[in-house]
Amino acid sequence: EICGPGIDIRNDYQQLKRLENCTVIEGYLHILLISKAEDYRSYRFPKLTVITEYLLLFRVAGLESLGDLFPNLTVIRGWKLFYNYALVIFEMTNLKDIGLYNLRNITRGAIRIEKNADLCYLSTVDWSLILDAVSNNYIVGNKPPKECGDLCPGTMEEKPMCEKTTINNEYNYRCWTTNRCQKMCPSTCGKRACTENNECCHPECLGSCSAPDNDTACVACRHYYYAGVCVPACPPNTYRFEGWRCVDRDFCANILSAESSDSEGFVIHDGECMQECPSGFIRNGSQSMYCIPCEGPCPKVCEEEKKTKTIDSVTSAQMLQGCTIFKGNLLINIRRGNNIASELENFMGLIEVVTGYVKIRHSHALVSLSFLKNLRLILGEEQLEGNYSFYVLDNQNLQQLWDWDHRNLTIKAGKMYFAFNPKLCVSEIYRMEEVTGTKGRQSKGDINTRNNGERASCESDVLHFTSTTTSKNRIIITWHRYRPPDYRDLISFTVYYKEAPFKNVTEYDGQDACGSNSWNMVDVDLPPNKDVEPGILLHGLKPWTQYAVYVKAVTLTMVENDHIRGAKSEILYIRTNASVPSIPLDVLSASNSSSQLIVKWNPPSLPNGNLSYYIVRWQRQPQDGYLYRHNYCSKDKIPIRKYADGTIDIEEVTENPKTEVCGGEKGPCCACPKTEAEKQAEKEEAEYRKVFENFLHNSIFVPRPE
């Protein structure tokens, strides 16, 4: 019987009965938070052979071994993991051994065995026989091996029954408990599983089998299971499901996700029956089970229960991440914030359509609305009093709406209103009228010419660059000297520059009124000589990198027809010269014959130009005499070269701090102090432990279902 989806056994140990007929758990198995010590000997689930996701054990009092509960658990597939782990054993106070003596394969993910004060038989299990990679395993804070005295079957009687393998240069017997060896298949089987009698299974079997070379006798399948047979791929008209079996169209058409309160149904894509279309694809119509590629970003409709979504912080903007259509009204009220422009772009930058109105008020942190970089349609299905669908009031630092040269925005219904935006030029508003198709809709008082733009240099002259010179890390630029009507009004110039891989930047990118700015700024004083053109040397730049540069004149608040005159240049794109590339990365060499070396490498991290070729140099080295010192035909005489691994065994150090002999006459001395790198590694380790524990608690402590 296939059980699932995901089984959570908590609080009451008798819930274990739910596992009675399970052969496969399709999903995870949690056994946790059973605080009363019970006698688990009467509970045994020999039918359970496979868990498709992960196994999590946490705070189960009285449970001493898993071997009696799950004697035949053979495979944990790890199709979905718990924080990168397929097996988690955490704070199991009474567990003495793992004892899963038939566990042969963890297909994906690592193991985490932590804070189990009584747990032994950890160093006797060779996890490399079960997992592909053991480097991510985390086995910490269990009973110290010295206190365990783990003995494999037959060792005491000097008739060892288990096989030996090498772990960390220790060649030893491998077992799960005092009477259960760790099963190993003959080397002739290669990567294949084997029967209890060491006969090789069919290549499509995983873990074990009941008969050799038979794809219907597998305990679990390497790839997929269909109609009693292990198959390398699902047959025609069937689809991969949950990472391990094949199902037909009818099955897929009638299932819903239990994680959602909608009934959207599964889809078939790329031969798989899955909950959602993958990234970049969308359902092909409401009744369709199939996915088609999206044109551009995939549409995602977001709806606000209360009709109007107030964006007053990054947190509230976060709720709109990925939304392309917003059903409702947007009220933007950003008074302060850190790096606000780029944060808002990150979370709201995909919105293309707002069905109601957009209102921006008291948003003193905003310099531009360019964070709504994909907004193309305001439908105005709902409007503010006075029939406004775009309303901009009292934004003290708002200088730009959008870059109208690269923006099409339509306001389908409703009027616009602008008032008390002192840095927003009226010309910018008039331009928006033209682009959005609202010209003629507004009445006279809707766009206030007195209090919009009264503190901005709205009549701008254009500064022209006169020369540019580049080297590998410098740019020299000069520009025409600007001459306002009264030369005393010109104070200085400000040069803005930044890296720009593409020629698509605007003056207001990443800029907000709270100090965040993606542009670097340099002030340039006026040259004392009136005939000399102003200029600047920008240094410390990266080689072969395109930069965007523009210049602004800093002028006095000189009012002419109610507006300040100013000047700025167009944005200029300049690339620095090429330079020597950084060194090639990850150089590896290996010999594939007595006269050849194969050398591989990755490109340099900083090419500093267009790479055209590499130069490979080599030279002959003298042979290492060490290789000739030993008779390699005598197995016992092979010296093991131990390399320092850069870590300190903390236990050893604390127990006996004066054991290191410093050589010569010096005698014993104290353990070396920890290096900065070691301290940092320990700090990161402690942090990682906390993060995992938080994740565990957040995942398992959930409100009771209604």
């Epitope: 989806p5 999903g27 299932i255 309160s261 959207e264 409401s286």
Partner: nanobody, 128 residues
């Protein structure tokens, strides 16, 4: 508090039609999947039809395919079941149900465990 009220049931002759309605309150109707179930005397409750919230994708039991049509009007917070070509075996109490989040994994649309809220039911009798 979530409330579901079914209406539209009654006595109808074989081959006749009925339209059931289910009005919901206490929830954001437009975000929940919904379904109709029925229970005939002495039988288990069975799924008749279901509909999703976001796209309106529909599901039908084989026994009613081509005869029944499920629909919803989110602006009126109402779910409908149009029943045509009724047969004697359609006699049952018809219940309206609202989806709820129910842990991990998946379930078939006609599994009662996927639904968290239920109406009191409306009786449909098909008899000549």
């Amino acid at each position: 508090e979530v409330q579901l009220v079914e209406s539209g049931g009654g006595l109808v002759q074989p081959g006749g039609s009925l339209r059931l309605s289910c009005t919901a309150s206490g929830l954001t109707f437009g975000t929940f999947g919904m379904a109709w179930f029925r229970q005939a005397p002495g039988k288990e409750r069975e799924g008749v039809s279901a509909i999703s919230a976001s796209s309106g994708r529909t599901y039908y039991a084989d026994s009613v395919k081509g005869r029944f049509t499920i629909s919803r009007d989110n602006s009126k917070n109402t779910l409908y079941l149009q029943m045509d070509a009724l047969r004697a075996e359609d006699t049952a109490v018809y219940y309206c149900a609202v989806r709820s989040k129910n842990g991990a994994g998946y379930g078939f649309w006609y599994e009662a465990r996927l639904y968290g809220y239920w109406g009191q039911g409306t009786l449909v009798t098909v008899s000549s």
